[in-house]
Structure formats: structure tokens, C-alpha cells
Amino acid sequence: EDELQVIQPEKSVSVAAGESATLRCAMTSLIPVGPIMWFRGAGAGRELIYNQKEGHFPRVTTVSELTKRNNLDFSISISNITPADAGTYYCVKFRKGSPDDVEFKSGAGTELSVRAKPSAPVVSGPAVRATPEHTVSFTCESHGFSPRDITLKWFKNGNELSDFQTNVDPAGDSVSYSIHSTARVVLTRGDVHSQVICEIAHITLQGDPLRGTANLSEAIRVPPTLEVTQQPMRAENQANVTCQVSNFYPRGLQLTWLENGNVSRTETASTLIENKDGTYNWMSWLLVNTCAHRDDVVLTCQVEHDGQQAVSKSYALEISAHQKEHGSDITHEAALAPTAPLGGSG
């Protein structure tokens, strides 16, 4: 008879994670007597996958009934494939022997590649908020995919971004891979409602990419603009001064009124008005009894927003000479300074 040949007809087999892989092997002869074994890898470090002779291989089933003597099909099926199963599998015929069976002939090998889906992309933004016109970085990570080929895109409000850097690790062969990408985004005042999207396309996703999102509201801080004005009052001995705090984000805001540098009142913003762009407005007012002042009054609206250094705007409230002479008894209308406030933001 011709010498036995071990035929592995497929050079490669690709299987999706979780499925079963069938590795085909046929012999051309029954001789010599001895077991068939399947190994992953070659050489001294090869891993035994199946031994016809003995052992418990719960994930491996033989495709044919090996107890039939005329059976020459030694194909196996491996269930519940994971990326860790990737590698080259060899069907090997051994000749019965002692102290060990003797390797007689090996098949050429079948490379098993495992298609594993990438994990849902996780997008994370900067640890601290930044203000408009500044650039912030967003990272996107996904793991556990195979094969290595993968496409990652960044979008901001549907517009594709170009300023990003992507790495796929490891660089060499591996059972599965990870992707890490960092995108640089320039913030604008209108970005409170903006989103960045990391989109991943992979062969396992069948044209339906995975997306991870992050809201720029978590990354942006829009500092408020302040305007201090005086409102007309009927009572001649009272002045109503308002501080309009506009277009700020996030909500956290504390306002302090100072009269000639002395704290008059502190309040925390509560009932806010939300603008279309997601920023907030708030107004605070201060009622000043002009009779209590013999001299001009500098009123300062000081705002601490989102734990940042305070900003302030001042307003000079003039007390008329007539009121100064008669002191607090005079109930005439106080002369007001020009409507233009005193400058100052500190």
C-alpha cells in the first residue's frame, strides 16, 4: 500500500466568536496502527486539542464515527470559539509505540482565524472643563476585536473631524486587538448641546457600525457676561440696581453684592432661564436706601461661576449734594450717575 498521507484540505478557516469551527482532516490509509491527534501550533510548545486515544476534550467532537475501522475522516468540530482559539491547527497521525507514541505524519495545517466583534466604543472627555476657543481632547476605546483591520471616524454634530490620532494594539499578531483614538476639538460658545461621536466599522459588524458618544456639555464652561443697570423707582429715597448674568454654563453660580467693597448680600443662582443654545441667564437685583448714604456708592456685582475666579462689574450710584446736606432726613430723589457703569472685572 502507498504510505499514509494526512490531508487537511483547507489552508484557512474563519469563524465568528461563539460559533463552532470545523477543522477537516482525512487519511489515505489505516496503516500504521496508532492514534490521531490534533494540535494547535507546531514544535515543542504545541497545544494538544484532541487525542483519539485518551483524555477529556469537552469542546471537541469528531465529525465522523471514529470507532468505525474503515473511517478515514478525522475532522473535528470545536464549539464556542473565542479569539483565544485562533492559530494553526495540525492533524497528526501517530504510530503506536512506547514509552510514547511516535509521530508518523502531520497534515499541512489549517489556520483558524476568529472574527470577534469590537466592544461598544467608550468615549471620554477631558477631566476639567475648558472655555470656548480652547481645544479639548476626547478619547475613544474599543477592545476584543479580530481581525485587526478596523476603521474609526470622529464626528461633531454630524460633521466628520480630521484632527485625531488612532492606534491599534498590539502591533504584531494577537488573538484580539484594541483601538485607542484621541480627537482634538475646538470649543465654541454654542457647544453646550453639541455631541462628539466615535464610529467604529469592522468586518464583524456587517455594515452597521458601533458608535460611542460624549456630550460637550461635560467638557465646556461658558463664562457669564455681566451687566449692571439701574431701574427707575417711584420712591425717591430708593434705587433698584440689577445685575444681569448672561450666557453661562454650567448652572453653578454664586453672586455677591458689595456696597463700597463691603458685602451686602450673597445668593446662589436657582431659578435660571435656559437659552436655546443651552446656556443660562439669571438676574439679581439690589434695593439701595439712598438716605443711608451721605457719599456716592459704588455697587459691585461679583459672580463666581463653576468654581472659577470671580468676575465683577461695578456701578457708581451718585448721592446728590442736596441729600448729603440734609442727611437721612432728606427724601428728595437721589441724583443718579450716568447710566454707563463703572468698568471693572476682577
Epitope: 500500500e1 489505516l30 496503516i31 496502527v33 496508532g34 492514534p35 490521531i36 483519539q52 486515544k53 485518551e54 471514529l66 470507532t67 468505525k68 475501522r69 474503515n70 473511517n71 503506536k96 509505540g97 512506547s98 514509552p99 510514547d100 507514541d101
Partner: antibody, heavy 118, light 107 residues
Framework: EVQLVESGGGLVQPGGSLRLSCAAS????????MHWVRQAPGKGLEWVSA???????YYTGSVKGRFTISRENAKNSLYLQMNSLRAEDTAVYYC????????????WGQGTMVTVSS | DIQMTQSPSSLSASVGDRVTITCRAS??????LAWFQQKPGKAPKSLIY???SLHSGVPSKFSGSGSGTDFTLTISSLQPEDFATYYC?????????FGQGTKLEIK
């Protein structure tokens, strides 16, 4: 049903000859290594001879040159031609099938008695 | 030739007992060891191959172990039908050889 049935045993004088037959049913005999095993009265088992699927033959030392194992595929039968018989060849002879891949004995016939005596 | 030595040669036991028979090869036989059961006037019956694998239809009370030169056959709970002679056999290389047998008798 897989079965082996031996025949051809009997009483023979020392120096005489006998041909044992083993008819196989339920499987193709030529696809298996086949064996003859004997058991002298009140003694243990002794392997005698084997024939491989390629027609290769093997014998225990005491029968070499006197016994010949063969098979006839068309009849799905195994044979043991015994010449120059001796008193010590007296035994029950069993036809045995070797296992699928390792030649472990799995199927035994019921045996046939060979008595060598004058 | 490879010599096979069984011990004990005979063994008395009671129904329900657990018994162990040992077999030693004169040289390493890998795990190409078989066990057979034979009752008087009957052909041997194959129990175990490759030291520990049970032939089809053999009850799980029979178990085998060992590799290299030392092997054991264990019957976990003896029943009346288990009283018989047991043989080990090496089949790694020709000539295949048997142990001398262990006769298991009822006490």
C-alpha cells in the same frame, strides 16, 4: 450484529495439520487487524498470531514456521493453518478482532478446541 | 518479549466489596494495556483498553488506571456475576502478551 464464529477444531495426532476458520459477520474483516489467541486447558491466555490490514503477519515464537495466518476477503473469513502440531498446541483457539485505531481486542469468537494427542 | 505480571493470582472477596488487581509490565508499554474478564467455559470479554477506557456496554463499576509499567483494575462494588478470572494484556508491540490471570472467588 458483529460476530466471529470459529470452526475446524478437533483431535489431531502430533505432527499433523489442522486448518481453523473464522467467519466474520456485521463488519468487513479486511478493514481490521485480526488475531488468534489460544488457551490451554486450565491455563491462561496466549496470543498466537495476527494479520494486519495490509496483509502483514505476526507470530509468537513457539509457532513461527509452523502456523500460517491468512484471510479471504471475498468470504469475509480468517484462517489459521497449523502444521507440525505438538501436544503443547492443545488449546481452545479464539478468533479476535483488533480495535479500530490501536488494535485493542474488542470482539471475541466463542472458540474452537484443538486437541493434539496420539 | 514483554512480560506481564499480575497480582494477586487469586483473591477472595464478598459481594459489595471493592477490589483492585494490579498488573506490571517488564518495560514501558505507554498505556497500551487491556483488561479482560473470563468465566469458566466462556470466551473472554473485553473490559478496558488503553489502560482506562471502557469498552462499549461495560458497566462503570469497572475502572482502570496506570501508565508506563504499573496498572490497576478496580471493581467498585462486587456483584455475583463479577466472580471470574481477570487478565491484563499489553498490545504495544508484538508478540502481544497476557498476564497469568487473577482468579476472583466468592468468600
Amino acid at each position: 450484529e458483529v460476530q466471529l464464529v470459529e470452526s475446524g477444531g478437533g483431535l489431531v495426532q502430533p505432527g499433523g495439520s489442522l486448518r481453523l476458520s473464522c467467519a466474520a459477520s456485521g463488519f468487513t474483516l479486511s478493514s481490521y487487524d485480526m488475531h488468534w489467541v489460544r488457551q490451554a486447558p486450565g491455563k491462561g491466555l496466549e496470543w498466537v498470531s495476527a494479520i494486519g490490514t495490509a496483509g502483514d503477519t505476526y507470530y509468537t515464537g513457539s509457532v513461527k514456521g509452523r502456523f500460517t495466518i491468512s484471510r479471504e476477503n471475498a468470504k469475509n473469513s480468517l484462517y489459521l493453518q497449523m502444521n507440525s502440531l505438538r501436544a503443547e498446541d492443545t488449546a481452545v483457539y479464539y478468533c479476535v478482532r483488533g480495535g479500530v485505531w490501536d488494535d485493542a481486542f474488542d470482539i471475541w469468537g466463542q472458540g474452537t478446541m484443538v486437541t493434539v494427542s496420539s | 518479549d514483554i512480560q506481564m505480571t499480575q497480582s494477586p493470582s487469586s483473591l477472595s472477596a464478598s459481594v459489595g466489596d471493592r477490589v483492585t488487581i494490579t498488573c506490571r509490565a517488564s518495560q514501558d508499554i505507554n498505556n497500551y494495556l487491556a483488561w479482560f474478564q473470563q468465566k469458566p467455559g466462556k470466551a473472554p470479554k473485553s473490559l478496558i483498553y488503553t489502560a482506562s477506557s471502557l469498552h462499549s456496554g461495560v458497566p462503570s463499576k469497572f475502572s482502570g488506571s496506570g501508565s508506563g509499567t504499573d496498572f490497576t483494575l478496580t471493581i467498585s462494588s462486587l456483584q455475583p456475576e463479577d466472580f471470574a478470572t481477570y487478565y491484563c494484556q499489553q498490545y504495544v508491540s508484538y508478540p502481544y502478551t497476557f498476564g497469568q490471570g487473577t482468579k476472583l472467588e466468592i468468600k
